[in-house]
């Protein structure tokens, strides 16, 4: 691993997941141990990231269970590498009007997708809903994530080094606590609420507006419960 | 190889429900959504619903809201979807297809369901 | 709801022939556009995602083009197992599909 690591100083209060949506449904952006990458329909372990903002729009996203980086090729295609190359690994974040968030390789200009197509990023473009993501709190208990917290006084330092390679064990100071509206989720279908027979809000209009809350990569805004 | 499997020919009487299964195998079950198509004789495809295989969460088009009932059984790898009240314009052949974000890829071989008195 | 129109409903062509296939949707759509071909008792086969990339294992006589609103399939030489049945759909909002374009033999 760098050691000048983009994840130093992160904690697991940070993890979020980043997500495609239609009225229909969504897809979890997850990094395998493997480093393929593809989408699950619901939060996984291996869609947990650590998403770290660079200067200019730039950010850098690893998959905490995969202890691997998000990169692309100069094919367009992503990938999970325990490498980190700044050209390939480094993405341009830009908030789109309707509030979802696109990401492209600055080196190779492709968007960040779910889809099997690569394209290009234009400004002014309107990618197709899986180049489109939001990003949404972690709601898997850590307990999940089978990886063993440094118990004090038991592990040396070095230990601890090589169980938590990118230091996302730490403890650090909390992040400020996301705003409600970040979990807030719609009613379900067994509710008995006006909403029930149209959870997903489809009836008033396709994409959900995520104007409101709009943080950036590391916040999260309001989201509908795609099923 | 990826395959899903769909239940026998079934007629129903008007009024009645019916509900027809597909077995999904060749692949991780949970990790695609499945949706339900159908197609009346001699007319085009007409998406129903869509159903989450992991929390069995669903949504359905406006047109079949109340009728149509989509479930999942992880344990065998098998999506189910029920139609009630049922009427002559329902006898179509109904599809099962596997959602890969951008397509539905793989498709069931189909239902056909005949609702005649 | 995104409304998809195909034209034409129907066409009749001769194997060799180029037939082009268009599908109009309500509102802009991206790529977010697949194409199906369905013959007669079978289930639907994906040609075409994206609006523009072939599924494999589609022959390469298969294309599509377009973004936003309109689009086009296109056969660049019309053979014997290309009579049936073409369907758009889009992955925009929802799922819908358009009517479905008829080729058969002239």
């Known amino acids: 691993y760098p050691n000048a690591s983009p994840l130093l100083g992160s904690s697991w209060g940070g993890l979020i997941h980043l997500y495609t949506a239609t009225a229909r449904n969504s897809y979890h952006l997850q990094i395998h141990k493997n480093g393929h990458v593809d989408g699950a329909p619901h939060q996984t372990i291996y869609s947990a990231l650590m998403i770290r903002s660079e200067d200019a729009g730039f950010v850098v996203i690893t998959g905490v269970m995969s202890r691997r980086y998000l990169c692309m090729d100069f094919r367009g295609n992503i990938f999970g590498s325990h490498y980190f190359d700044p050209e390939n690994c480094r993405f341009q974040h830009q908030t789109l009007e309707n509030g979802y968030d696109v990401y492209h390789s600055p080196q190779y200009h492709f968007l960040v997708s779910l889809g099997r197509a690569k394209r290009a990023f234009l400004p002014g473009m309107n990618p197709p809903p899986y180049s489109q993501f939001l990003s949404r709190r972690n709601e898997i208990p850590l307990i999940h994530f089978n990886t063993p917290i440094p118990r004090r006084h038991t592990q040396s330092a070095e230990d601890d080094s090589e169980r938590d390679p990118l230091n996302v064990l730490k403890p650090r100071a909390r992040m400020t606590p996301a705003p409600a509206s970040c979990s807030q989720e719609l009613p379900s279908a067994e509710d008995n609420s006006p909403m029930a027979s149209d959870p997903l809000g489809v009836v008033r209009g396709g994409r959900v507006n995520t104007h409101a809350g709009g943080t950036g990569p590391e916040g999260c805004r309001p989201f509908a419960k795609f099923i | 190889q990826v395959q899903l499997v769909q239940s026998g020919a079934e007629v129903k009487k008007p009024g009645a429900s019916v509900k027809v299964s597909c077995k999904a195998s060749?692949?991780?079950?949970?990790?695609?959504?499945m949706h339900w198509v159908r197609q009346a004789p001699g007319q085009g495809l007409e998406w129903m619903g869509i159903?989450?295989?992991?929390?069995?969460?669903?949504s359905n088009a406006q047109k079949f809201q109340g009728r149509v009932t989509m479930t999942r059984d992880t344990s065998t790898s098998t999506v189910y979807m029920e139609l009630s009240s049922l009427r002559s314009e329902d006898t179509a052949v109904y599809y099962c297809?596997?959602?890969?974000?951008?397509?539905?890829?793989?498709w069931g071989q189909g239902t056909m369901v005949t609702v005649s008195s | 709801a995104i409304q998809l129109t195909q034209s034409p409903s129907s066409l009749s062509a001769s194997v060799g022939d180029r037939v082009t296939i268009t599908c109009r949707a309500s509102?802009?759509?991206?790529?977010?556009l697949v194409w199906y071909q369905q013959k007669p008792g079978k289930a639907p086969k994906l040609l075409i995602y994206?609006?523009?990339s072939l599924e494999s294992g589609v022959p390469s006589r298969f294309s599509g083009s377009g973004s936003g609103t309109d689009f086009t399939l296109t056969i660049s030489s019309l053979q014997p197992e290309d009579f049936a049945t073409y369907y758009c759909?889009?992955?925009?909002?929802?799922?819908?599909f358009g009517p479905g374009t008829k080729v058969d033999i002239k």
């Open positions: 297809a596997r959602d890969i974000v951008d397509a539905f890829d793989f």
């Open positions: 060749g692949y991780t079950f949970t990790n695609h959504y």
């Open positions: 159903i989450n295989p992991i929390s069995g969460s669903t």
């Open positions: 509102q802009g759509i991206s790529s977010a």
């Open positions: 994206d609006a523009s």
């Open positions: 759909q889009q992955f925009n909002d929802e799922f819908t």
